[in-house]
Interface confidence: medium
């Protein structure tokens, strides 16, 4: 989109960025607003109701002034002009300040994460080298699902100290591969907490926990709820004994009956002796009948 180069009409040269400019035609804005003036007074643009097409002209002026990408002093004050930027524009930026990131996320607040925002976040995080606690705090405040949008490789750059910023709802959409990466970090982050406090913090990460950690939790009277149990890795649940599951769930063990057709409960039941299941008094069916020999095929494969 090119605006014809025309001379600025007499008396219309902009001395400052102010409300009078909303009455300028697009060609007048192009001709009468100095790009350097615009760059130094970017904070005013947000307070002036420029139209969609007028904003195109202002962006064009900034693009001409900064062909290599805008400086952070301009980026921080872009306001809703940010919505005009393409991912290609944003890739030219070097955003280092968390305040700048917050200012731009604020503009997009309440909307889905746009390609522009995704690019901005990517540039910011790569510039910092890791996803530190303050950044994670900010990102999850604006986008609760942000953490689960990262690949396991990207999550590996999250330092354990950042895990303190994670809220349970931030993990709602994480898949097992992501939790596999996050769980060891959470375990490390919360290691100095006592039993009940530790469980409250680690609970939402348990979808990445191995069998031995679940066995250890079963010794601590944690009373895990069924929703958490259903998110555990099937391979981590299968080796647990009936007694261990009973201790792990505490009073919530009764909920197993309602979930007996769903994984991981279904698969776990198939691995237990029916005698042992009967001790729960829940009427769980599908266990190994009495007198049958249980072969641990996984152990056999490992030996051969």
């Amino acid at each position: 989109r090119e605006v014809e180069k025309t001379a600025c009409p007499s008396g219309k040269k902009a001395r400052e960025i102010d409300e009078s400019l909303i009455f300028y035609k697009k060609w007048e804005l192009e001709a009468c607003v100095d790009a350097a003036l615009l760059a130094t007074q970017m904070d005013r643009v947000n307070a002036i109701p420029f139209t969609y097409e007028q904003l195109d002209v202002l962006k064009h002026k900034l693009d001409e002034l900064y062909p290599q990408g805008y400086p952070e002093s301009v980026i921080q004050h872009l306001g809703y002009l940010f919505l005009k930027m393409s991912p290609e524009d944003i890739r030219k930026w070097n955003v280092t300040s968390l305040e700048t990131l917050k200012a731009l996320l604020e503009v997009n607040k309440g909307h889905e994460m746009s390609p522009q925002v995704a690019t901005l976040i990517d540039r910011f995080v790569k510039g910092r080298g890791q996803l530190d606690k303050d950044t994670l705090d900010t990102l999850t405040a604006f986008y609760p699902g942000y953490l689960c949008s990262l690949s396991p490789e990207e999550l590996s750059s999250v330092p354990p100290s950042s895990i303190w910023a994670v809220r349970p709802q931030d993990l709602d959409t994480c898949d097992p591969r992501q939790l596999d990466v996050l769980y060891p970090k959470a375990r490390l982050a919360f290691q100095n907490m006592n039993g009940s406090e530790y469980f409250v913090k680690i609970q939402s990460f348990l979808g990445g926990a191995p069998t031995e950690d679940l066995k250890a939790l079963s010794q601590q009277n944690v009373s895990m709820d069924l929703a958490t149990f259903m998110k555990l890795r099937t391979d981590a649940v299968l080796p647990l004994t009936v007694a261990e599951v009973q201790k792990l769930l505490g009073p919530h063990v009764e909920g197993l009956k309602a979930e007996e057709r769903h994984r991981p409960v279904r698969d776990w039941i198939l691995r237990q002796r029916q005698d042992d299941l009967d001790t729960l008094g829940l009427g769980l069916q599908g266990g190994i009948p009495n007198g049958y020999l249980v072969l641990d095929l996984s152990m056999q494969e490992a030996l051969s």
């Epitope: 909303i22 035609k25 919505l83």
Partner: nanobody
Framework: DVQLVDSGGGLVQAGGSLRLSCAAS????????MAWFRQAPGKEREIVAV????????YYAESVKGRFTISGDNPKNTVYLQMNSLKPEDTAVYYC????????????WGQGTQVTVSS
């Protein structure tokens, strides 16, 4: 295209209040700026207030600053003009308007609603 339907005008005593509404329809309403203009008998049409949907920024003519408030309800695609402390000189036909370009080109207009302020 954008269609605008304005309403809420009427007869009011000086010092009274009115609220005008403008319902906008069309595929890309959110990319338009909305405004209220007015035209008194024998006078030119003048801009009263402007709002930018996206940024929420506003503009007011000097004559109405502090008395009139323009606001938008994005989900409803409706713009309001709350008019307080009305004066006889506010008497005019008020028009809702929308543009993506500038207020001097490519502007869509509502049908107008009469506001009469009696002394």
């Amino acid at each position: 295209d954008v269609q605008l339907v304005d309403s809420g005008g009427g007869l009011v005593q000086a010092g009274g209040s009115l609220r005008l509404s403008c319902a906008a329809s069309g595929r890309t309403v959110s990319t338009y700026n909305m405004a209220w203009f007015r035209q008194a008998p024998g006078k030119e049409r003048e801009i009263v207030a402007v709002i930018n949907w996206t940024g929420g920024s506003t503009y007011y003519a000097e004559s109405v600053k502090g008395r009139f408030t323009i606001s938008g309800d994005n989900p409803k695609n409706t713009v309001y003009l709350q008019m307080n402390s009305l004066k006889p000189e506010d008497t005019a036909v008020y028009y809702c308007a929308a543009t993506r370009a500038s207020w001097t080109e490519n502007t869509y207009w509502g049908q107008g609603t009469q506001v009469t302020v009696s002394s």
